[in-house]
């Protein structure tokens, strides 16, 4: 019967001679050279050679366990004289023994990961994995330990799992957003002489709402003409927020001030500006200055950061109303006057009054629009607005006179207003009856 144990061969042999594997031996072999040993199977005759007389096997080449860990060969012992086998052909194994010739290799050369800023210490970031081609069942050649070469004190790595975690409190994206962490994987359980590999992990802190909006100035002033219709934008204010995305979104509101009902603020979603607009008609003569308190706030607030203070800021907005010269205003929309048809020339019929609505109360002068009184029947006192006749009237000719009176600001003739006057001529019995009458 055959006499051998399993053969073991150390990989990566560096000696100058062939590497000795072991000896095939049959108990039929009496040492007289009558037996011939034959080798067949994986690598026989090429990788593995056998001394046909002694049964000694040698490896002719350097072997790599990671390439092929086991070789299956067959052995024969043949009687040289008869050519017959003295043993049944038998299969045997040459097992390649591992040495630590492979460093750990990470599954990625570069990892990218994100973690929210201001995360608690120990927050999971990413797991890196390195594999070692050496034999994990024998020794520590494939026992990998992870350590951090670059990236402290911000991050740490779990030595056995490769899990990277945050290691520093209050890491602030607004202060620093990008970190490059270098992780080492070392075999031999991290001991001296172990082989190592590294990978780079690019970590980006993602934004959380940890910054409130802030107005760059405490006071703003805008001016607007009193004639601005509701909806008119009169100024823009902008609070800045160090956060990004929805965390930097700002809503503006008017929270206080005399102009609370006179002005609105709308948020321009594109520019994140607050646009102050006119809400109600303004009047310089009523109020010239409004002071508003405008607030900028984040609509999306993270409760855990409320301890940092309110996520809003306020500024004072002073709005100065500009005077717009307005034309005189008559006391009535139309005047109806009456006069007897027998009135003498220069008889006063009545009067009109108009006033400059501006605060300056510019004096007003009156005149008759002659296009409406071509015959110059009526006249007006330019100073006090008294209407009087300048010709005799006849009701039978014209019952109603429709004229227009103009009021003009003395200091600013461009500012004028018009009002209609309806003058009714009252009948006086000044005409004898006409036609024939017959008596009975």
């Amino acid at each position: 019967s055959w006499m051998w144990n399993q053969f073991f061969l150390l990989e990566e042999y560096t000696g100058s001679d062939y590497q000795y594997v072991g000896k095939l031996h049959s108990d039929q072999d009496r040492g007289d050279g009558s037996l011939k040993y034959i080798l067949s199977g994986d690598g026989a005759g090429d990788l593995f050679i056998i001394n046909e007389n002694t049964g000694d096997i040698q490896a002719t080449k350097r072997l790599d366990r990671e390439e092929k860990p086991v070789y299956i060969l067959r052995a024969q012992a043949i009687n040289r004289r008869t050519g017959r086998p003295v043993e049944p052909e038998s299969e045997f194994i040459i097992k390649i023994h591992d040495i630590n010739d492979n460093e750990p290799i990470f599954t990625k050369e570069v990892y990218t990961a994100t973690v929210p800023e201001m995360s608690d210490v120990g927050t999971f970031v990413v797991q890196v994995t390195a594999t070692d081609a050496d034999d994990p069942t024998y020794g520590n050649s494939a026992k990998v330990v992870y350590s951090i070469l670059q990236g402290q004190p911000y991050f740490s790595v779990e030595s056995e799992t490769g899990i990277i975690k945050t290691a520093l409190l209050n890491m602030d994206r607004e202060n620093r957003e990008q970190y490059q962490v270098v992780i080492q994987a070392k075999d031999m359980g991290g001991q001296m002489g172990g082989l190592s590999g590294t990978t780079t992990v690019n970590i980006t802190l993602t934004d959380v709402n940890d910054n409130p909006p802030r107005f760059p100035q405490s006071t703003y002033q805008f001016k607007t003409p009193e004639s601005s219709p509701p909806g008119t934008p009169i100024g823009r204010i902008k609070a800045s927020d160090a956060d990004v995305g929805e965390n930097a979104e700002i809503e503006y509101s008017i929270t206080d001030g005399e102009g609370l009902d006179m002005f609105d603020v709308i948020t321009d979603q594109e520019t994140q500006e607050g646009i102050i607009t006119v809400k109600k008609l303004l009047d310089f003569e009523k109020k010239k200055v409004y002071t508003l308190k405008v607030e900028a706030s984040n609509p999306y607030v993270e409760p855990r950061f409320l301890y940092l203070g309110p996520f809003k800021d306020s500024a004072t907005v002073r709005i100065v109303v500009e005077d717009v010269d307005e034309p005189p205003v008559f006391s009535k929309l139309a005047y109806i006057l009456q006069i007897r048809e027998d009135a003498q020339i220069n008889t006063t019929i009545g009067s009109v009054t108009a006033q400059d609505p501006d605060a300056a109360r510019n004096p007003v002068k009156y005149s008759v629009d002659r296009h409406t009184d071509m015959d110059r029947i009526f006249n007006i006192d330019s100073g006090n607005g008294s209407i009087f006749t300048s010709k005799l009237l006849d009701r039978e000719t014209l019952l109603w006179h429709n004229i227009t009176v103009i009021a003009t600001e003395i200091n600013n003739p461009k500012q004028s207003s018009r009002v209609p006057l309806y003058i009714k001529v009252l009948d006086v019995n000044d005409n004898a009856p006409t036609g024939l009458s017959t008596g009975a």
């Epitope: 703003y220 310089f284 010239k288 100065v320 005077d323 605060a359 300056a360």
Partner: antibody, heavy 122, light 106 residues
């Protein structure tokens, strides 16, 4: 030419009131804002408030709110500034100054009165 | 409220000197700034408005510059009548004056 002529110096006791006048000429009194500014001895200038004589509207500095009253008499083109509850810190020269704009309450002061010294002393 | 800070608070100079006075606002006031000159016992006199516009009748040796929150008044060649106190004033929002700079004879 525009002129602002103020009333003469006053000596007042603490707790009393003082009323300083400022007569305007050379322009339409009702069309410009009239401001009051004071200057304590050896100190800087301090804005107190304004009036628009056209309709009597006023605005006062927060510091003087409740203690100062500014009025105007358009018939005499005169503005008045009354300061009540006087204390020694109110010792100052009080100036009236015309606001450059008639159209809105803003801008610099282009003409100043000669000043009125108010001394508050017990 | 907007605060105005003037510097220096005083300076000594000789006739013919170039003098520079600065004024700093606590926030952006754009160009809403005036400079006044005041002599002892007199009312302030307007020199410059809108930061750099010379008031009618003011000698051209006076000039103003700046915008935002930093402003300068320059007297290119000091004359005997220029020894006085100079004030800056913001009128962007309300009214506030600097504490003044006294220009004295060296």
């Amino acid at each position: 030419e525009v002129q602002l002529v103020q009333s003469g110096a006053e000596v007042k006791k603490p707790g009393a009131s003082v009323k300083v006048s400022c007569k305007a000429s050379g322009y339409t009194f009702t069309r410009n804002f009239m401001h009051w500014v004071r200057q304590a001895p050896g100190q800087g200038l301090e804005w107190m408030g304004w009036i628009y004589p056209g309709d009597g509207e006023t605005e006062y500095a927060q510091k003087f709110q409740g203690r100062v009253t500014i009025t105007a008499d358009t018939s005499t083109s005169t503005a008045y500034m009354e300061l009540s509850s006087l204390r020694s810190e109110d010792t100052a020269v009080y100036y009236c100054a015309r606001g450059v704009y008639g159209g809105f309450a803003g801008g610099y002061f282009d003409f100043w009165g000669q000043g009125t010294l108010v001394t508050v002393s017990s | 409220d907007i605060q105005m800070t003037q510097s220096p608070s005083s300076l000594s100079a000789s006739v013919g000197d170039r003098v520079t006075i600065t004024c700093k606002a606590s926030q952006n006031i754009y160009k809403n700034l005036a400079w006044y000159q005041q002599k002892p016992g007199k009312a302030p006199k307007l020199l410059i408005y809108d930061a750099n516009t010379l008031q009618t009748g003011v000698p051209s040796r006076f000039s103003g510059s700046g915008s935002g929150s930093d402003f300068t008044l320059t007297i290119s060649s000091l004359q005997p009548e220029d020894f006085a106190t100079y004030f800056c004033q913001q009128y962007y929002s309300g009214w506030a004056f600097g504490q003044g700079t006294k220009v004295e004879i060296k």
